[in-house]
Interface confidence: medium
């Protein structure tokens, strides 16, 4: 008789995530020497650790706690780079500003990119059919338990000035529930930070509105100023100039604002 | 699944008109710049119009400034291409793509095919 | 008379490494981002390349770059199907429009 398996709402584990996770450690590891020391089969054993046999709605920061040890990395802390609903600009940024580091630039954050993973309570299975979705099921679930550590923690690490990339395009340019709001913002070291610079990236060509005065912004503002955080802001006009301004400075085009 | 389908192609007198249809699927249509790209038989891609995500600009090429008209309706997830007073030199296979200013026409739809003829 | 220029066509053996050029000016490929497109026969195009880089489920044998006022597409350990016409992209500046190469057919021997 096939055993109950517990049906959740979230897509299950991605396939091949064993494989993937421990694939992914090799690529970083070569391509980032100062990681080179990482023994990536212990990587994957303190991952599998984490979320193994354990019920996929109790899942604590604890877990992770060998998996952030083993995963430990100095990143420049006046060169982060967060973002919040706009992922895929942000990391072709740092693709091409090479000294700036998202999350997902870092070992751990680079190896749980687009990844969905979760365990049965005791039993050593990986559950490939569902997982728990942070809505309709649980939050303290793998995936978001995951995200939420990994993110506090870089948050903490930052200092000077700290950049944050957010879509304009969004009714919500900044909101409280989004990792960013709810996890990053707070978890900014004051007497590290001096100014958290936000990018607000337009997303269309008609769209002259100054975007750093949406009332999203000014809360966003308001919280980082209680936290005694200068704030700033800047309109992101054209993001494709942007990116090509970051690439070649001295482009005749690149001298009018962006 | 993301997906666009156009319809409405066909054959029609020059002179006449047409109207072509683009539907989106499986993604946020207001987040995205949308475009209409042609191909005439054995001929390479043309750019034809674009309208920004809340359709307060749009764009044509030369080659049809004053005869087709772009247009949206957000809340139907749908694009349009008014085609007016069409010449023989406007038959061509018509495709609608999806644009984000930092990722390219990474979405395109199967195409429509108009031929002008008497 | 296309805005960017592209040779007509290339061919290489299977294997072998090829380079697609696409020449423009200061207006498009200089102050933009360029886009490549592979048009497989019979079939919509498709976003192969952009900002140098690849979208999710594009193999890393296509690589993009770009230096001043001109833009290349190569093509490593080249495959049969790869054989397809390939098109530069970029917005122009000038012209207030999108501008495409007029398309390189590549053909795999």
């Known amino acids: 008789v096939p055993r109950w398996r517990q049906q959740w709402s979230g897509p299950g584990t991605t396939k091949r995530f064993p494989e993937t996770v421990l694939a992914r450690c090799v690529k970083y590891t070569e391509i980032h020497p100062e990681m080179r020391h990482v023994d990536c089969q212990s990587v994957w054993d303190a991952f599998k650790g984490a979320f193994i046999s354990k019920h996929p709605c109790n899942i604590t920061e604890e877990d992770y706690q060998p998996l952030m040890k083993l995963g430990t990395q100095t990143v420049p802390c006046n060169k982060i780079l967060l973002w919040s609903r706009i992922k895929d600009l942000a990391h072709q940024f740092t693709q091409v500003q090479r000294d700036m580091f998202t999350l997902e630039d870092t070992l751990l954050g680079y190896l749980a990119d687009d990844l969905t993973w979760c365990g049965e309570f005791n039993t050593s299975k990986i559950n490939y059919q569902s997982c728990p979705d942070w809505r309709k099921d649980c939050s303290n679930n793998p995936v978001s338990v995951f995200w939420k550590t990994v993110s506090r923690r870089f948050a903490e690490a930052a200092c000077d000035v700290v950049h944050v990339m957010l879509n304009g395009s969004r009714s919500k340019i900044f909101d409280k529930n989004s990792t960013f709001g709810s996890v990053e913002v707070h978890n900014l070291q004051p007497e590290k930070v001096q100014t958290l610079e936000a990018w607000v990236i337009h997303g269309g060509r008609e769209d002259s509105r100054d975007l750093c005065q949406d009332p999203t912004i000014k809360e966003l503002e308001s919280i980082i100023s209680k936290r005694n955080i200068q704030f700033s802001c800047k309109n992101i006009y054209r993001p494709d100039k942007f990116l090509q301004c970051v690439k070649n400075p001295e482009d005749s085009s690149c001298t009018s604002e962006i | 699944e993301v997906q666009l389908l156009e319809s409405g192609g066909g054959l029609v007198q020059p002179g006449g008109s047409l109207r072509l249809s683009c539907a989106a699927f499986?993604?946020?249509?207001?987040?995205?710049?949308m475009n209409w790209v042609r191909q005439a038989p054995g001929k390479g891609l043309e750019w034809v119009s674009s309208?920004?995500?809340?359709?307060?600009?749009?764009g044509y090429a030369d080659s049809v400034k004053g005869r087709f008209t772009i247009s949206r309706d957000n809340s139907k997830n749908t694009l349009y291409l008014q085609m007016n007073n069409l010449r023989a030199e406007d038959t061509a296979v018509y495709y609608c793509?999806?644009?984000?200013?930092?990722?390219?026409?990474?979405?395109w739809g199967q195409g429509t095919t108009v031929t002008v003829s008497s | 008379q296309s805005v960017l220029t592209q040779p007509p066509s290339a061919s290489g053996t299977p294997g072998q490494r090829v380079t697609i050029s696409c020449s423009g000016s200061?207006?498009?490929?200089?102050?933009?981002?360029v886009n490549w497109y592979q048009q497989l026969p019979g079939t919509a195009p498709k976003l192969l390349i952009y900002?140098?880089q690849r979208p999710s489920g594009v193999p890393d044998r296509f690589s993009g770059s770009k230096s001043g006022t001109s833009a290349s597409l190569a093509i490593s350990g080249l495959q049969s199907e790869d054989e397809a016409d390939y098109y530069c992209?970029?917005?122009?500046?000038?012209?207030?429009?999108?501008?495409f190469g007029g398309g390189t057919k590549l053909t795999v021997l």
């Open positions: 900002n140098a």
């Open positions: 200061s207006s498009n490929i200089r102050n933009n981002l």
């Open positions: 992209a970029a917005w122009d500046d000038s012209l207030n429009a999108w501008v």
């Open positions: 793509a999806n644009y984000k200013s930092y990722y390219g026409m990474d979405v």
């Open positions: 309208i920004s995500i809340t359709g307060s600009w749009t």
């Open positions: 499986g993604f946020t249509f207001s987040d995205y710049e």
